[in-house]
């Protein structure tokens, strides 16, 4: 088999004898899977990432690669091992015929195989530059800490590191892994090759137009002169960063990935591993005016995914497309007409637009936050980014209707002071993927490893759902929502909070026999109620109304429909106090809200009663939103009455700790 570029001499015709002594059978009952990019034009058939099981050692990876070569040679196929992965993910990159996939999937230790695919710079026009001087007074923006303790890695095009705006701030590593440029007549003009990366380096750390003016950067070249790279090249780049981190541990690391490709299991997995090694990854949501969950690394939960807004806080339109959106976006940031260093000359500036520019802003803000508080974990940093964002300023009408509720209405902002936020109880809302419409379909929302799940709710556009419950999965609580017969699917909504030294548990009451409804409370000493969930097996709860307001003196109680099981999230943490706040509207209304007061954080959001005309409940920042079916379809007024129940908490312990520091 000839490979496309005719590079035969380096291909290894492995000897048949290599196979001898390597007859380990694949683990019984496990089947490796094959994955490829859903976007056909972005596929790169002929190159495959073979991902091995987690505990596979380097020697086993090498042996498995040799075994593949030997078995391929036996069948008359040439293969070439391009890279053996270790340090981040075990596995190898192989150039081979697709005919060999079945064989490769049966090799020992193989977890899955992914066909290589393209990734792209996320700026427009990333190579059509309009030179403009900085259009503001530089002394208007003097950040308190310029991010000097933080190193920002940039995986992008080559960059002009001696540009006046970034000279001395960027160390160009010797890492380069890029595909050939497309087209026979492509002219490799240096300034165009450097355009995207130079601009982003300037946005992050430029002297005059940068966000974190003190941050130092390291650049890795994973995008070619056309702004195109590969998943495999990006993986090898991430591995390079991990190895550098191990060889020479420095302070906090931020990795900026201003690129996007189709959904990639392996790229997301690599990002997860790097994030769990303490690295903060920031990526572009993508410029496809589409759900960011369909792209990588934007869809990786551990990555901070950034959409783009303009000066009017509106989502950025880019030609016929625009910023991506949806539940995989963490927040938005400026991404239209952003001025930064231009590679056209050493003192030139240019304006570029896209989610790359937005991600660069957030990488700069992250660098400054980490420089001020180097011990911040990824979860703490993400929560702070969300907390300090401008809320509810984006015009959601720009997003498709079904994505509006899922897309965070947050625009990144620098904290007013980089210190002193430690006393806050930080929480965020995490939406699951859609369950799909089958009768038994469920959706699961998860918090990050060092966050606590304090409450769980669900939402269905059709209203046909069977509630939600918190359950243990792999030693951690998750939020599971249940679809109902005839439903179009549900979402699970987790409220994920930073609560140090917390001990949380779920108390469940089965459906009540009596007509008073189901109740459950936190009975352990020192435990407070942080959230209520209800789950039912019947298809339609009907109109039964339990007493909505709790009896006085029983704040630690969840109440619900008599046919539903009720789940109380009960937590003990130093100084944690919570209170229930309700807002009931007697007349039918499509939306009922209740918000926590200043100084209190929303941890739980649920609806009473749990009848079928209630679409669900979810938290938006510090407000609990309960949505009901269109009033015109609900029938009687009594059934239309809905109460939004918020549980608001604060931590006196965190407040005291903060005061002691000051």
């Amino acid at each position: 088999q000839e490979d496309e570029d005719g590079d035969y001499e380096e291909l290894v015709l492995a000897l048949r004898s290599e196979e001898d002594g390597l007859a380990e059978a694949p683990e019984h009952g496990t089947t490796a899977t094959f994955h490829r990019c859903a976007k056909d034009p972005w596929r790169l058939p002929g190159t495959y990432v073979v991902v091995l099981k987690e505990e596979t050692h380097l020697s086993q990876s090498e042996r498995t690669a040799r075994r593949l070569q030997a078995q391929a040679a036996r069948r008359g196929y040439l293969t070439k091992i391009l890279h053996v992965f270790h340090g981040l993910l075990p596995g190898f990159l192989v150039k081979m015929s697709g005919d060999l996939l079945e064989l490769a999937l049966k090799l020992p230790h193989v977890d899955y195989i992914e066909e290589d695919s393209s990734v792209f710079a996320q700026s427009i026009p990333w190579n059509l530059e309009r030179i403009t001087p900085p259009r503001y007074r530089a002394d208007e923006y003097q950040p308190p800490d310029g991010g000097s303790l933080v190193e920002v890695y940039l995986l992008d095009t080559s960059i002009q590191s001696d540009h006046r705006e970034i000279e001395g701030r960027v160390m160009v590593t010797d890492f380069e892994n890029v595909p050939e440029e497309d087209g026979t007549r492509f002219h490799r003009q240096a300034s165009k090759c450097d355009s995207h990366g130079t601009h982003l380096a300037g946005v992050v750390s430029g002297r005059d137009a940068g966000v974190a003016k003190g941050a130092s950067m390291r650049s890795l070249r994973v995008l070619n002169c056309q702004g195109k790279g590969t998943v495999s090249g990006t993986l090898i780049g991430l591995e390079f960063i991990r190895k550098s981190q191990l060889v020479q541990p420095v302070g906090p690391l931020v990795v900026l990935l201003p690129l996007a490709g189709g959904y990639s299991r392996v790229l997301n997995a690599a990002c997860q591993r790097l994030a769990r090694a303490g690295v903060v990854l920031v990526t572009a949501a993508g410029n496809f005016r589409d759900d960011a969950c369909l792209y990588s690394p934007a869809s990786a939960p551990e990555v901070i995914t950034v959409g783009a807004t303009n000066a009017q806080d509106q989502p950025v339109t880019l030609g016929t497309l625009g910023t991506n959106f949806g539940r995989c976006v963490d927040l938005f940031a400026p991404g239209e007409d952003i001025i930064g260093a231009s590679s056209d000359c050493s003192t030139c500036f240019v304006s570029q637009s896209g989610t790359s520019q937005a991600a660069a802003h957030v990488a700069g803000i992250a660098a400054m936050m980490l420089s001020a508080e180097p011990e911040l974990t990824l979860a703490e940093l993400r929560q702070r980014l969300i907390h300090f964002s401008a809320k509810d300023v984006i015009n959601e009408a720009w997003f498709p209707e079904d994505q509006r509720v899922l897309t965070p209405n947050l625009v990144a902002a620098l904290p007013p002071s980089t210190h002193g936020a430690g006393w806050q109880l930080f929480c965020r809302t995490v939406w699951s993927a859609h369950s799909g419409p089958t009768r038994m379909a469920t959706a699961v929302a998860r918090c990050a490893p060092d966050e606590e799940l304090l409450s769980c709710s669900s939402f269905s556009r059709s209203g046909k759902r069977r509630g939600e419950r918190m359950e243990a999965q792999g030693g951690k609580l998750v939020c599971r929502a249940h679809n109902a017969f005839g439903g179009e699917g549900v979402y699970a909504i987790a409220r994920c909070c930073l609560l140090p030294q917390a001990n949380c548990s779920v108390h469940t009451a089965p459906p009540a026999e009596a007509s008073m409804g189901t109740r459950v409370h936190c009975h352990q000493q020192g435990h407070v109620l942080t959230g209520c969930s209800s789950h039912w097996e019947v298809e339609d709860l009907g109109t039964h109304k339990p007493p909505v307001l709790r009896p006085r003196g029983q704040p630690n109680q969840c109440v619900g429909h008599r046919e539903a099981s009720i789940h109380a999230s009960c937590c003990h943490a130093p100084g944690l106090e919570c209170k229930v706040k309700e807002h009931g509207i007697p007349a039918p209304q499509e939306q009922v809200t209740v918000a926590c007061e200043e100084g209190w954080t929303l941890t739980g959001c649920s609806a009473l009663p749990g009848t079928s005309h209630v679409l669900g409940a979810y938290a938006v920042d510090n407000t609990c939103v309960v949505r009901s079916r269109d009033v015109s379809t609900t029938g009687s007024t009594s059934e239309g009455a809905v109460t939004a129940v918020a549980i608001c908490c604060r931590s006196r312990h965190l407040a005291q700790a903060s005061q002691e520091l000051q």
Epitope: P134, D139, S161, D162, G168, D208, K213, S346, T347
Partner: antibody, heavy 115, light 109 residues
Amino acid sequence: QIQLVQSGAEVKKPGASVKVSCKASGYTLTSYGISWVRQAPGQGLEWMGWISFYNGNTNYAQKVQGRVTMTTDTSTSTVYMELRSLRSDDTAVYFCARGYGMDVWGQGTTVTVSS
Amino acid sequence: QSALTQPASVSGSPGQSITISCTGTSSDVGGYNSVSWYQQHPGKPPKLMIYEVSNRPSGVSNRFSGSKSGNTASLTISGLQAEDEADYFCSSYTSTSMVFGGGTKLAVL
């Protein structure tokens, strides 16, 4: 350590050319260009231009544009500044300095233009 | 004629503080964060003392500090010492080049 070492003093006649060299060491050359600055006797500093070690691009001050050429030899980590059609008011000490930030300076090269 | 205006001379006694000003326009000092200050002793190359308005390179005494307001940058030297006697130059970016001040001769009395 980071060093910029310049060539020795030159005496030239009006109308002639001079070529001063500056050898850089001790840092990643491509992260910084080299600026050239001159100082006439008893006078202030005058920025003449900049050249990139990365791609050879140049940025010349208007006052000397057309008479100055800056070049690099990456194999020897050396930058050259050639000034043509010398006049008596070009008599000065010529310094090379690292980048636009000019955080490290060469020792200076005295160029005397005299008939 | 230099693009940035500095006083020709400034003097002070040991232990005192002095301030040297550097005035430009919104196209140089006022428009950029990159104002630097250099110290030059006779027969020596200039030495960077302050960069990007107020940052000190490692090895430079914390007696030297920089600031900026509008189109004017300032260098302050506190606790004057005899070795501070030298010429001081400010510099700034412009849109495409660099400009220096005419220099200020500091005498320590």
